[in-house]
Amino acid sequence: AGVFELQIHSFGPGPGPGAPRSPCSARGPCRLFFRVCLKPGLSEEAAESPCALGAALSARGPVYTEQPEAPAPDLPLPNGLLQVPFRDAWPGTFSLIIETWREELGDQIGGPAWSLLARVTRRRRLAAGGPWARDIQRAGAWELRFSYRARCELPAVGTACTRLCRPRSAPSRCGPGLRPCAPLEDECEAPPVCRAGCSLEHGFCEQPGECRCLEGWTGPLCMVPVSTSSCLGLRGPSSTTTGCLVPGPGPCDGNPCANGGSCSETPGSFECTCPRGFYGLRCEVSGVTCADGPCFNGGLCVGGADPDSAYICHCPPGFQGSNCEKRVDRCSLQPCRNGGLCLDLGHALRCRCRAGFAGPRCEHDLDDCAGRACANGGTCVEGGGAHRCSCALGFGGRNCRERADPCAARPCAHGGRCYAHFSGLVCACAPGYMGARCEFPVHPDGVSALPAAPPGLRPGDPQRAGVIAVIVVVVIAIVAGIVVLVISRKKRMAKYEKAEIKEMGEMHRELNA
């Protein structure tokens, strides 16, 4: 368990032309607040997805009203730290998302209006218990300066807050004030206790009894804001004549520069010259380079052209954001025409077309039934932009490719026996019944109930087979004509069907990839 802490130092227009003068809209005054969102590991989720490690919201900052013709200042910020408690292990690598929100205080119907002013997203590596890490990030025309750290809460200790320190009954082999640490008996650890009175907000320590100050603060307990007034050039105790507080010890005492940086004094403060690969006030920030793999989702990392931009990510299709961390919903652009269904497969976009349309974006209208090949002598019927097949006897399904069993529905009434025939079906009626479906009872005197069967077609009539044979020949002739017609049409438009089948196959394969 532990706490992630974020300190916002400044938020304001970035350098260069075209910087915004005010965060507020023309509707009047506004105030700022911040939201921090933490995601564990090498998350590639969009910023909108849940903040699995936790999130926090700052208080509202002071009301800001733009001063006409005044230089755009750093904007008034909410007081205090943003703290995100975490229950489990600190992951070490995490995504840090900081959002700057604007609350408009003009006459809004239904209360204040909120809008997102800027969002920075960075993948970072950070050990718990380490010093404050500094960062400067640009979001559009805005610049955000902040520091952050992760600290364990006792009894948790270690860089991941996974080890528990607890007193043991055995005699301690550790030095005074230190406790044996479970589970490793030969390890003794305690979080550094800063110098008594060291500011919790503006100071930190890496060694017990130390008090190091964040940028903008000075003094032995980091209580003194660094001012540009001339009194800061003085050395010695507080100057009662000027009303300025001046720190006694020199700012480079104890070398506040980390990672091998060298310290040089400046009026009332100090300056670190950092070795290659480090930056920040005390060289405490390790410069993220392309070798760190800062681009999510396989994005291409390119070294930035200017010193402020350590790298630029060139994102794969379907991703955007400064670190390629946001998934683009490409289907929201409705690329599929004619009512096609859009499928964003991540690495590619596919359209599943409605019947009667084909092509990568369903742009081809398969008119005149051209693309709807009806098999086995079926005929294509158009209607309302859709196409359907009217199948020949004995066939069914969308394209008449399925052989239908005409006897499956038991069409012969009164116990008649059904025989499947290539032209349809034939019913052999039970004694006492007649008709195509054995639907008519035969009266004992040989006369059927209405409608009467014509002479020569009574049950058992020897001419019946001959008549059926004639009907069969006629049906064959008709079917043959239809088949010839369909084949010529099928050949003419076969390429469309092939393209559509290939497209469907590819889509199926990619969806299963």
């Epitope: 590991g41 090498l42 590639e44 793999g293 800062p294 291409l300 060139h314 299709p317 497969l345 690495h347």
Partner: antibody
């Protein structure tokens, strides 16, 4: 300096197996997608397969020509990616390169695989 | 898969010449095209990404252009170290596919 070093190539009979390794240095390996790309003698480049990150559950993707025969794995603790090649065919003869990312930005020097009876 | 057709397959040029290599995609690939340089016995090196952006450390004489289906790599003034084989690759649709290569030889 970023370095990718492939090893494990050699001569193998058709139907045989081979395991290639690619050791990375100079990069935070666990943050990079890794690919294998091959080049048959005197021919162009052909993407073989890819393995993504732990956060992607080490998802793998393969070219149709090797699907079911080749397997890519990675060991982030060792900064190494592997290509296990089974049921090798003569047409698998090539120089095999490991590369990073979606756009193949860093490349190894390659290792030669010869499949011949 | 998207096919990338590169032309010419080889060309002869002299130091100082302006050289143009073209690549045609079988379907629209936006600007998701990269160019690679490969010298004999060496691994390919990324030159251009996003159709027209030079990768880190690539000399300014190399430039790329195009979008959709037609792409061009231009070497404004050929240098002795530029004699190599050049490949285009599309990254719009998975899997990535490459052109057949263009060998630039000394005239």
């Amino acid at each position: 300096e970023v370095q990718l070093v492939e090893s494990g190539g050699g001569l193998v009979k058709p139907g045989g197996s081979l395991r290639l390794s690619c050791a990375a240095s100079g990069i935070t390996f666990s943050n990079f997608w890794m690919n294998w790309v091959r080049q048959a003698p005197g021919k162009g480049l052909e993407w073989v397969g890819q393995i993504r990150l732990k956060s992607d559950d080490y998802a793998t993707h393969y070219a149709e020509s090797v699907k079911g025969r080749f397997t890519i794995s990675r060991e982030d603790s060792k900064n190494t990616v592997y290509l296990q090649m089974n049921s090798l065919k003569t047409e698998d003869t090539a120089v095999y390169y490991c590369t990073t990312g979606y756009y193949f930005d860093y490349w190894g020097q390659g290792t030669t695989v010869t499949v011949s009876s | 898969n998207i096919q990338m057709t590169q032309s010419p397959s080889s060309l002869s040029a002299s130091v100082g010449d302006r050289v143009t290599i073209t690549c045609k995609a079988s379907e629209n690939v936006g600007t998701y095209v990269s160019w690679y340089q490969q010298k004999p016995g060496k691994s390919p090196k990324l030159l251009i990404y996003g159709a027209s952006n030079r990768y880190t450390g690539v000399p300014s004489r190399f430039s790329g252009s195009g979008s959709g289906t037609d792409f061009t790599l231009t070497i404004s003034s050929l240098q002795p170290e530029d004699f190599a084989t050049y490949y285009c690759g599309q990254f719009y649709s998975f899997p990535s596919t490459f052109g057949g290569g263009t060998k630039v030889e000394i005239k």
